[in-house]
């Protein structure tokens, strides 16, 4: 097991998850850790505890390893970090990777006020309701601005969007969370259509899919609840 020393001089590795950082309960996920070609061992930590290790075969000069989680559950959802060793030295810790498990317990209802088809500039609010008491709700937009919002609430939360622009159009879903990394099933999708304005188009995004695989977001919330942009499919944390 890695021992902290003053000589932690190697650069920190990069950590990411594929196919995504949001994993349906019972599904598998790969956590990749990229360090150096000279690395003799990689260690993966989960919530601060030693989780797994890999010693790359000398014949394969690869600078990354894959850790496989065969069945994602609420027990494996949380914050992961990795380290690597080269010679006698250990690297600094990677940035945290936040893995979320979805598909737990219940399915929320999502609706939009005043209606799903609105005029440019009209005020719009999304409502998310979950019968099971929860601590926080998340609203996600597919393929959109890469933003996710969260609101605290017991069984219902509202997400005021303000005067809408064309950037707001698209398909939304919401989740209730039992903790930051254990989420409900997704709601049914709600598509927001925007009409009016210079180019009168009420088209939603043309991509026909409503699969979670196409969502783009990052789970490091700021105080306002909005998130920084980050690719969903290939979620890499790196500074």
């Amino acid at each position: 097991q890695r021992i902290n020393t003053e000589k932690e001089t190697l650069p920190k590795p990069i950590i990411w998850a594929k196919p995504s950082i949001m994993v349906t309960n019972g599904n598998s996920v790969n956590i990749w850790c990229q360090g150096a070609q000279s690395a003799s061992e990689y260690q993966l930590y989960f919530e601060g505890s030693f989780f797994a290790l890999e010693r790359p075969k000398p014949s394969r000069s690869m600078n990354k390893v894959r850790f496989f989680i065969s069945q994602m559950t609420s027990h494996t959802a949380g914050i992961y970090t990795c380290f690597y060793q080269s010679g006698e030295l250990w690297s600094k810790s990677s940035n945290p990777l936040k893995l979320v498990v979805t598909g737990l317990y219940d399915t929320p209802n999502l609706w939009v006020y005043p209606r799903p088809e609105v005029t440019l500039g009209e005020n719009v609010t999304f409502f998310c309701q979950l019968k099971t008491a929860t601590s926080k709700f998340f609203l996600l937009k597919e393929r959109g601005s890469n933003h996710i919002q969260n609101k605290y609430g017991n069984i219902q939360a509202e997400f005021p969007m303000g005067p809408v622009t064309r950037a707001h159009r698209g398909t939304y879903r919401c989740f209730g969370s039992y903790n930051d990394y254990a989420w409900s099933f997704p709601s049914e999708p709600v598509t927001l259509l925007i009409t009016g304005g210079v180019e009168n188009s009420s088209l939603a995004p043309t991509d026909p899919t409503s699969s979670l695989d196409y969502w783009e977001f990052d789970l490091s919330t700021n105080e306002s609840g909005l998130q920084k942009d980050s690719a969903f499919w290939d979620h890499t944390t790196q500074n």
């Epitope: 797994a52 075969k57 390893v65 894959r66 496989f68 989680i69 065969s70």
Partner: nanobody, 126 residues
């Protein structure tokens, strides 16, 4: 579905040896990473040793040099050879598997394992 059945537990004197076996059902054994955990009375389950599907091993500091984990893919069995046993080794020993797994992964955390045996009791006393 994978089933794990441990055997080989029993009572032994301090300094003695035992070999635990864990037989796995199914044809997925060669693609599984395996581990041994133990739980002493009134204590939490703790990691003992693990082996990757390519025979790379890792041990808890408390058993390093005394215990050896190995596997026989032809027999679908993983072993824990325990020697120089001490009173503090008294516990129920559990075999666990990660199925499937990838490459040379060795799993140390119990949350990683998706299949568990029922356990076998090892008692070390004079």
């Amino acid at each position: 579905e994978v089933q794990l059945v441990e055997s080989g537990g029993g009572e032994v004197q301090p300094g003695g040896s035992l070999r635990l076996s864990c037989a796995a059902s199914g044809r997925t054994f060669a693609s599984a990473a395996m581990g041994w955990f133990r739980q002493a009375p009134g204590k939490e389950r703790e990691f003992v040793a693990a082996i990757s599907r390519s025979d790379d091993t890792y041990y808890a500091d408390s058993v390093k040099g005394r215990f050896t984990i190995s596997r026989d893919n032809a027999k679908n069995t993983v072993y824990l050879q325990m020697s120089s046993l001490r009173a503090e080794d008294t516990a129920v020993y559990y075999c666990a598997a990660v199925v499937p797994t990838y490459g040379n992964n060795i799993y140390v955390h119990s949350a990683a394992y998706n299949y568990w045996g029922q356990g076998t009791l090892v008692t070390v006393k004079p």
